[in-house]
């Protein structure tokens, strides 16, 4: 149950964490299970224990085997096992299945590929990334912290991605590579009856005569690419362009896609030099798509200047 598979390539650094967790203050002893021989903690050794971590700097094929870690506290001992396999480097480009970390899936909106196990190492940016052994080049690929971001993901982006970084231990550098598959899933979008987020229905907006005022119509229409979705303003049931008041203009806001994937649109109504007659108008925020149309109505009211007299 408390056993973990770990693997690496010869002449690369490999760091393994004890599968049994404990407080940093607990001592952890490591043993090579076949011989029950204790793993030294002195850093001058090629293989040494450092608390919860077992470090192979660098690893050799002969290091393969099962390692036992015992987490010792004042009241209990917990035992875990690390099954370590060190492989010879492949001469060809092919990365065998047994060297692959878990597959990750991405889509047009989410295309992060995390470099496996990197958190165990003392590394500095940037990471190097390869796809099917070719170094990734071009503005679509961005190495960011411990992950790779691919812009505008396409099905052709599926494949095996290898991250390469340098682990530093007491001034000595060791290379580490890790490979995982990336699959591209088609993110199914859908369309909903429009939902207006702002303004609230029958909202009263306070404005100051002679000042400028902005009203934002914001609505969401579903997930993914939306066809024939729009937000717009009407005055007394008339389109802004047909109303014929140059002081009142609408301006497209940003197309938004929120973290929950909802596709939303904004339209800002700008009223310059608010006049008394503007308070008599009915301002309709319309959101429409293939499913239908929804309307929220706003009216303006005069904001009374604050009386500063004591």
């Amino acid at each position: 149950k408390f056993s973990k598979q770990s693997w690496g390539l010869e002449n690369e650094a490999l760091i393994v964490r004890c599968p049994r967790q404990g407080k940093p203050s607990y001592t952890v002893d490591w043993y090579y299970s076949q011989t029950n021989k204790s793993i030294p903690t002195q850093e001058r050794n090629r293989v040494f224990a450092s608390g919860q971590l077992l470090k192979f700097l660098p690893a050799a094929v002969a290091d393969s085997g099962i390692y036992t870690c015992i987490v010792r506290s004042p009241t209990f001992n917990r035992t875990g096992y690390a099954n370590v396999t060190i492989y010879k480097k492949q001469s060809d480009c092919n990365v065998p299945d047994y060297l692959m970390y878990s597959t990750v899936s991405g889509s047009e909106k989410n295309s992060k590929i995390y470099c496996p196990t990197i958190d165990l190492y003392n590394w500095t940016a940037p990471l190097e990334w390869f796809k099917n052994c070719q170094a990734l080049q071009g503005s679509r690929y961005r190495a960011h912290k411990s992950f790779l971001v691919i812009d505008n993901v396409m099905t052709e982006d599926a494949g095996d991605y290898t991250c390469k970084f340098i682990h530093n231990e007491n001034g000595a550098n060791y290379s580490v590579t890790a490979t995982r598959s990336f699959t591209v899933k088609d993110e199914q979008g859908f369309s909903l009856f429009p939902v207006i987020g702002a303004p609230a229905q029958n909202e009263i907006k306070e404005v100051e005569i002679g000042k400028n005022a902005n009203l934002t119509c914001s609505a969401c229409f579903g997930k993914g690419t939306q066809f024939l979705a729009a937000v717009l303003w009407q005055l007394n049931g008339t389109k802004i362009t047909d109303f014929g008041e140059p002081r009142i203009q609408q301006e497209e806001g940003q197309n938004q896609s929120f973290s929950n994937g909802l596709a939303c649109l904004d339209m800002v109504l700008r009223i310059a030099d608010v006049k008394e007659e503007d308070l008599l108008l009915q301002y309709d925020c319309l959101a429409l798509n293939l499913h239908g149309l929804r309307r929220h109505t706003v009216r303006l009211s005069r904001k009374n200047p604050i009386d500063h007299h004591s």
Epitope: F193, H291, R294, R295
Partner: nanobody
């Protein structure tokens, strides 16, 4: 509502629905139908001056919805009628939503029967 009746397949009918009690500043009017033993379905809807219209796939190209704002009346011109168009047709109105979903409408007419025989 008015304009319902019996007609042969391939014939035409024009339904009309007059709304009262609202000041004109944008209203949606829609037509819905319900055949015996079936669920109510949206047929067509129109918002204010007809700039925004919605049609059920089953009637596209055959039915036309239009509006006379001066009379606060909405019309449904039904051409190339089929026996499956037989149903009670209802007019509905709402100030804030428009489309083919009946649950969004607040005001409903009594209905007019349309029967299409083969």
């Amino acid at each position: 509502e008015s304009g319902g009746g019996s007609v042969q397949a391939g014939g035409s009918l024009r339904l009309s629905c007059a709304a009262s009690g609202y000041t004109y500043s944008g209203i949606c009017m829609g037509w819905f139908r319900q055949a015996p033993g079936k669920e109510r379905e949206g047929v067509a809807a129109i918002y204010t001056n007809g700039e925004y219209t919605y049609y059920a796939d089953s009637v596209k190209g055959r039915f036309t919805i239009s509006q006379d704002n001066a009379k606060n009346t909405v019309y449904l011109q039904m051409n190339s009628l089929k026996p499956e168009d037989t149903a009670m047709y209802y007019c509905a109105a709402d100030r804030n939503t428009c489309g083919l979903r009946g649950d969004f409408y607040n005001y409903w007419g009594q209905g007019t029967q349309v029967t299409v025989s083969s």
